[in-house]
Interface confidence: low
């Protein structure tokens, strides 16, 4: 017997077919134990990690991962060539840039080599699973006496593929002011008070032109501008993670 289970996921583009099969029709006593879900993220379009929770297995099992693309010259699965391990048990696979094709459906199969009938297949849209590097080289310049411009750089990914979240606050502010900047790695603040000290930081995501990734990068290193006078209450101005 076999059954198909549709798994819901935080990423609505991910659909997984869990194919559960018993060894023989006369042995219907216990269904095959489901396999853990595979989660993949493409890091800055440099490499991809597909990982699973190996500790969810009742006994230590070196699960194997095979993958292919839905539309490709060769429709056979290829096995992971670079496994990631947790406590000496396979818990993921790292796939290099040459094997990443963002705009083809990525088909990934997790299998228990001891029980080949125990396998799970998932289909992923990789363009929605890109996590960029944190923006770098933040620089501030004066456009005029009271107007500041912040610029930054993103490595390896075209700027127009990224959306940026800029946060800034002065030493008098209790919270960040934030705004979305699309595609252009710059932001100008029309009015600054030279008696205040400002802090800026930026993060990015691969959205919405080239993909629909909801995952933000890490925050950039903060940059500061303005008065170096001692803040009245420094504890208010520590950067949150």
């Amino acid at each position: 017997w076999s059954s198909k289970v549709l798994m819901s996921s935080a990423n609505e583009d991910i659909k997984a077919d869990l194919i559960l099969t018993s060894t023989a029709p006369e042995h219907l006593s216990a269904p095959t134990l489901p396999l853990p879900e595979v989660q993949c993220f493409v890091f800055n379009i440099e490499y991809m990690n597909c990982t699973w929770n190996s500790s969810s297995e009742p006994q230590a099992t070196n699960l194997t991962l095979h993958y292919r693309y839905k539309v490709s010259d060769n429709n056979t699965f290829q096995e992971c060539s670079h496994y990631l391990f947790s406590k000496e048990i396979t818990s993921g696979c790292q796939i290099q840039k040459e094997d990443i094709q963002l705009y083809q459906t990525f088909v990934v199969q997790l299998q228990d080599p001891q029980k080949p009938q125990r396998r799970a297949v998932q289909k992923l849209n990789l363009q929605n699973l890109v996590i960029p590097r944190a923006p770098e080289n933040l620089t501030l310049s004066n456009l005029s006496e009271s107007q500041l411009e912040l610029r930054w750089k993103s490595r390896h990914i075209k700027e127009r593929c990224l959306q940026y979240l800029v946060q800034y606050r002065s030493n008098r502010d209790r919270s960040w002011t934030e705004l979305i900047v699309n595609h252009e790695p710059r932001f100008s603040l029309p009015s600054v008070d030279e008696l205040k000290r400002y802090t800026f930081r930026v993060r990015s995501r691969y959205n919405p032109i080239c993909g629909s990734s909801q995952q933000w990068s890490k925050w950039s290193q903060p940059v500061h501008w303005g008065s170096h006078t001692v803040e009245e209450n420094p504890s208010l101005f520590a950067l949150e993670a």
Partner: nanobody, 129 residues
């Protein structure tokens, strides 16, 4: 101003050949993928062939073995040699430069198509039986 200019389109009998050429100006395209898309009336925009900055080529199944893509980074050009043309190859062919090799469909060729940064205006290819 960044521009992509296609040339080489025209009318040909089935089984004939055409060579499309695209030249980019206003920007060095050597880090971009460059490719050819096509759109027939009533159809979606589809990727015909693309070539990455390192020369790796991709071909749609429908053109494999018949079309050959090449590029010259120094001259910002990409060429598409089309042999054994079929009536179903009739379409407007667009040159594009962009971020990654592109897959999937979009309703119309142009800026909104996944990550391709620059587009030409298109050249008509008509293949009659």
């Amino acid at each position: 101003q960044v521009q992509l200019q296609e040339s080489g389109g025209g009318s040909v009998q089935a089984g004939g050949s055409l060579r499309l050429s695209c030249i980019g100006s206003g920007l060095p395209f050597d880090e971009d993928d460059m490719g050819w898309y096509r759109q027939a009336p009533g159809n979606e925009c589809e990727l015909v062939s693309s070539i990455s900055s390192d020369g790796t080529a991709y071909y749609a199944d429908s053109v494999k073995g018949r079309f050959t893509i090449s590029r010259d980074n120094a001259k910002n050009t990409v060429l598409l040699q089309m042999n054994s043309l079929k009536p179903e190859d009739t379409a407007v062919y667009y040159c594009a430069a962009g971020v990654h090799r592109q897959f999937g469909g979009s309703s119309s060729c142009g800026d909104a198509f996944y990550g391709m940064d620059y587009w030409g205006k298109g050249t008509q290819v008509t293949v009659s039986s």
